[in-house]
Amino acid sequence: SIPWNLERITPPRYRADEYQPPDGGSLVEVYLLDTSIQSDHREIEGRVMVTDFENVPEEDGTRFHRQASKCDSHGTHLAGVVSGRDAGVAKGASMRSLRVLNCQGKGTVSGTLIGLEFIRKSQLVQPVGPLVVLLPLAGGYSRVLNAACQRLARAGVVLVTAAGNFRDDACLYSPASAPEVITVGATNAQDQPVTLGTLGTNFGRCVDLFAPGEDIIGASSDCSTCFVSQSGTSQAAAHVAGIAAMMLSAEPELTLAELRQRLIHFSAKDVINEAWFPEDQRVLTPNLVAALPPSTHGAGWQLFCRTVWSAHSGPTRMATAIARCAPDEELLSCSSFSRSGKRRGERMEAQGGKLVCRAHNAFGGEGVYAIARCCLLPQANCSVHTAPPAEASMGTRVHCHQQGHVLTGCSSHWEVEDLGTHKPPVLRPRGQPNQCVGHREASIHASCCHAPGLECKVKEHGIPAPQGQVTVACEEGWTLTGCSALPGTSHVLGAYAVDNTCVVRSRDVSTTGSTSEEAVTAVAICCRSRHLAQASQELQ
Amino acid sequence: QEDEDGDYEELVLALRSEEDGLAEAPEHGTTATFHRCAKDPWRLPGTYVVVLKEETHLSQSERTARRLQAQAARRGYLTKILHVFHGLLPGFLVKMSGDLLELALKLPHVDYIEEDSSVFAQ
């Protein structure tokens, strides 16, 4: 019977004539930076080319006995998970292995850097099809390792890494913390985060998604036909490397940004029990388990968006946090969140010729997060329109006045410490979809975009008094681009997008003792691209 | 693996080279910074990645590495260049005493220096 992990990543409702996994990934080369491997194992023979690259530290301990099968264990298993004949994800993918980990599974940042450089030079000498680099390793945060990963990613290489097995914030580790790398956490057969002894999978905003990583059957270096079960975020990353290889084989022109968006889009949503994560990390950790797309024909017609959380701003009065999109993504909206509710909103601003999302802490606040909604919108021309605080009782409003531009997101930013102490704002009048409205003492920022066939609509859901959380979702065929809250009072902790749902968090009245009758409304901006849909229909 | 301490292949004697006469201060602009792993047991002091500014050519990387060796030798320190990076990041990997970090940070073209550290199979 099919191993649980392969079943889990296989879409539940695929049509047999459309989706044939056995020979997936044949146009892609996957580089594995790991231990030595037993490349003639029956499961992977002929699929893995062992390069002559080796850069490993001496093993610890004077009496260390180098047992070949132990030296090869980790790498052989991972090669089997990626491309093994019987238990592999991308059975058609070819692999190249570089030895950067010694027989104890230990390597160095410098050895890994030299390995990445080797891959880049190989790519320049002999350009092939799409490349995936699997880094099933982790060390402490390293500026230089992250920088090298960024350079390689910008050279068109897809890097996939383990989130780490430290039951900790993945942002504290490298290469897991590199934004350009696809960072993978581990889940088990029950879709629970994996526990590994006293530790377990890492989590947090630096994780892109999770994948099967417990009791994963794969090639064992104990003998040429042996299989063994191993667990860890390396195994999870190997699944995603295999899925990436299959996606790239089906669509070799996919960019890293497109691939990442597809991985997120086709993942199983909201199946992980978040109670396992520390409370302060739950909102930051993606509730996504990787899966293969239901068809290898891609999904070019979709408008893909993802949510990117910034690092925490820290508690100082003027502290800010910045969330950035990838180079070929568009920032379509910007929101902010503070656990204490003390924040001064957010704004979209240009930085180095690209829009970023900046959130502002308030006096007495414990800090804020900026939340960017990053989307793939070909041929987009986006700009930010700002209205300064109106000061009049009408509230501040701004709209997209350029012809053909549609509203994709609203942000508001205020200088006063606590909007809640001021007169309540007026809710946005209905029937004006291209307009952002906010508190009269706030400046309002509208993200306005022109793109072929782009259409957007506003969807709201309000409740009479703050109840902890208000949500509004975009319907099938529409993608959430903007998520904001009305009004921007001190009750509102912030707004953020989770998949296609806009979540507005506010203080529960029962806990604050407030008697405010103020409504809290979640405002979603839902968009779709008729242009992308038409283009994909023409290809069919 | 690289040689043990004291068994260097490249001993640089304190010979005055033409380069050595050049100014030791970095070019105008921001000072180079030093980084090391926050997890103490994972640190590997004595090996450093010297990262040079983005547009630095291979020849400049090699020249900077040689300059570091020459200046270190003048102060009585042995250094060994383990690898010169090019293709992804400009820079070099050097085995040297931590005492030389201040000197290395002042070299021209240096963006930052990171102490080597361990990575582990996950």
Epitope: D40, M49, R85 | -
Partner: antibody, heavy 115, light 109 residues
């Protein structure tokens, strides 16, 4: 191109031993082991076992256990199959093939066991 | 390890299609993606025709195709030609070894 070249025909007496060689070329040796397959006259194919160029590990068919030894010499890119205590029913053509996938075959070595 | 079961012989006229079956158990054919088919002409070494159930090596005619259902694998030859007359062997992984079928003699009438 990928090639497996085997040693010449052998005639042996019962109870003797035979050692057949198989020289591999045209591919990365360590990516594949060598399988040994035999075919008695007028009979089908019988898998005898596998040997690794990477680490010398072996995987023998149960029927062969104890009587056969498979080895490799990576320095000469050659695999060997030795069969001891030969019997008349060991008369067969012995083939080497690349890996478990057996995608490339040697030309075969005829071993005749006759008194 | 007992051999996989193949019909001793099959025949067909030029241009016709024939199918050779290969039946094993869940421990071999049914349990692995690695069923191969070999063609052997008299006095020659076997030649790989199909690997991993359905895949054709480069240079093998697309008239040869493989499939599998449960514990039975099949080789289909369409547009039968005189040079297809040969012995055909299937082969599968088992948990620790490899097993061949007894062979099928294909006669082109």
């Amino acid at each position: 191109q990928v090639q497996l070249v085997q040693s010449g025909a052998e005639v042996k007496k019962p109870g003797a031993s035979v050692k057949v060689s198989c020289k591999a070329s045209g591919y990365t040796l360590t990516s594949y082991g060598i399988s040994w397959v035999r075919q008695a006259p007028g009979q089908g194919l019988e898998w005898m076992g596998w040997v690794s160029f990477y680490n010398g590990n072996t995987n023998y068919a149960q029927k062969l256990q104890g009587r056969g030894t498979m080895t490799t010499d990576p320095s000469t890119s050659t695999a060997y199959m030795e069969l001891r205590s030969l019997r008349s029913d060991d008369t067969a053509v012995y083939y080497c093939a690349r890996g478990y996938g057996m995608d490339v075959w040697g030309q075969g070595t005829t071993v005749t066991v006759s008194s | 390890q007992s051999a996989l079961t193949q019909p001793a012989s099959v025949s067909g006229s030029p241009g016709q299609s024939i199918t050779i079956s290969c039946t094993g158990t869940s421990s071999d054919v049914g349990g692995y993606n690695s069923v191969s088919w070999y063609q052997q002409h008299p006095g020659k070494a076997p030649k790989l025709m199909i690997y991993e159930v359905t895949n054709r090596p480069s240079g093998v005619s697309n008239r040869f195709s493989g499939s599998k259902s449960g514990n039975t694998a099949s080789l289909t030859i369409s547009g039968l030609q005189a040079e297809d007359e040969a012995d055909y062997y299937c082969n599968s992984y088992t948990s620790t070894s490899m097993v061949f079928g007894g062979g099928t003699k294909l006669t082109v009438l």
